[in-house]
Amino acid sequence: HTAAQDNCTCPTNKMTVCSPDGPGGRCQCRALGSGMAVDCSTLTSKCLLLKARMSAPKNARTLVRPSEHALVDNDGLYDPDCDPEGRFKARQCNQTSVCWCVNSVGVRRTDKGDLSLRCDELVRTHHILIDLRHRPTAGAFNHSDLDAELRRLFRERYRLHPKFVAAVHYEQPTIQIELRQNTSQKAAGDVDIGDAAYYFERDIKGESLFQGRGGLDLRVRGEPLQVERTLIYYLDEIPPKFSMKRLTHHHHHHHHHH
């Protein structure tokens, strides 16, 4: 695991504690909550970030509010179980032995059950639609400029390979960013679209996960792009398994932010 060697910090994750006791005497940064060592040259997995967020002392919780990131059906925040690589375990349970299956971004994709519930595999979220509404501006943004700026952002800030940004749509004041990444497309070392979307989500909320870096200052041809509403849809490689009653009301998993 790598980290900034000069003062032993983690540029990509402020929710860490770093010390010079890693392999070979190198700087090692551990995610709060799990204690897992993270690779500070890339994004930290969403599972470890959620676990860190849930473990942070109340008086030190600078990144989030407890009611934030709630699912539409009020599942709310939870302290996830992460696998040895820091990814979500397919089955999540709370302290009262209520269990459910999640996808690769940690969103519930089944009805809740008991400890007998089986989640055979972690189903991959291969398509993420980020729906933004920007604050009123003097005029509409130029679509191609907006497209280029958002692609640059995902490439440079989140290190997401350009091929995974499938499209940027714009109909003032709505911007849609489509991220697509099938299991077969994701190579070792590639940033996961779920992790990139989560970092973007935090940035948009003014709660950057980056260490000591300024907040997100999105500008299109010098004009500030200020987001007033975010809606994120997650589509899985295998459709979710909710009861029929649920399916008539919700066709996708989504998170809603105001």
Epitope: V17, S19, D21, G35, A37
Partner: antibody, heavy 115, light 107 residues
Framework: QVQLVQSGAEVKKPGASVKVSCKAS????????IHWVRQAPGQGLEWIGT????????VYNQKFRDRATMTADRSISTAYIELSRLRSDDTAVYYC????????WGQGTTVTVSS | EIVLTQSPATLSLSPGERATLSCRAS??????IHWFQQKPGGSPRLLIK???ESISGIPSRFSGSGSGTDFTLTISSLEPEDFAVYYC?????????FGQGTKLEIK
């Protein structure tokens, strides 16, 4: 040279509390984790928890979360562990150790809990 | 929590022989395993860190290997002072845990 020097042996009654100190020297106290480990007579090693002195971030073994409190005083490079509501099975040698791989250990503090 | 299982519980060998101690983790922990020696009445002493990294001041007869879930501590030729209890410990994630120990005794 790096040294961790612990406070002396303690004899306590059940229900009481004990506080053990660990004074560090020979390195920058704030940059390394301090761990607490205990060993009951004739038994193996048991991890109690760890504290990062720079920001006092502490992590506890679930077993000790309700009774143990780890603190650190950066001004005197000393870490502490306090264990409350002592029981006879808390009788053990308590060690502090440095870094994720416990490269330096204190000499141990014997805590005896007996009525 | 990650469980570390050491084997054998007791190993009876003679000075000059080769000792092989095993530590198995309940899940993949990469190379985040460390080995300690403890003698009666003393504090544990770090022998090997991160599965195979040597420690200054520790004799070269001590070596470590393995990754993932299976790890080995090898003492190439036993000296009389090597008879002690040996523990493995992981630092993959919290809580850190120790193996139950292997007692190396003189045959």
């Amino acid at each position: 040279q790096v040294q961790l020097v612990q406070s002396g042996a303690e004899v306590k009654k059940p229900g009481a509390s004990v506080k053990v100190s660990c004074k560090a020297s020979g390195y920058t106290f704030t940059t390394h984790w301090i761990h607490w480990v205990r060993q009951a007579p004739g038994q193996g090693l048991e991890w109690i928890g760890t504290i990062f002195p720079s920001n006092a971030y502490a992590v506890y073994n679930q077993k000790f979360r309700d009774r143990a409190t780890m603190t650190a005083d950066r001004s005197i490079s000393t870490a502490y562990i306090e264990l409350s509501r002592l029981r006879s099975d808390d009788t053990a040698v308590y060690y502090c150790a440095r870094a994720s791989y416990f490269d330096y250990w204190g000499q141990g503090t014997t805590v005896t809990v007996s009525s | 929590e990650i469980v570390l299982t050491q084997s054998p519980a007791t190993l009876s060998l003679s000075p000059g022989e080769r000792a092989t101690l095993s530590c198995r983790a309940s899940q993949n922990i990469g190379t985040s395993i460390h080995w300690f020696q403890q003698k009666p009445g003393g504090s544990p002493r770090l022998l090997i860190k991160y599965a195979s990294e040597s420690i200054s001041g520790i004799p070269s007869r001590f070596s470590g290997s393995g990754s993932g879930t299976d790890f080995t501590l090898t003492i190439s030729s036993l000296e009389p002072e090597d008879f002690a209890v040996y523990y493995c410990q992981h630092s993959h994630s919290w809580p850190f845990t120790f193996g139950q120990g292997t007692k190396l005794e003189i045959k």
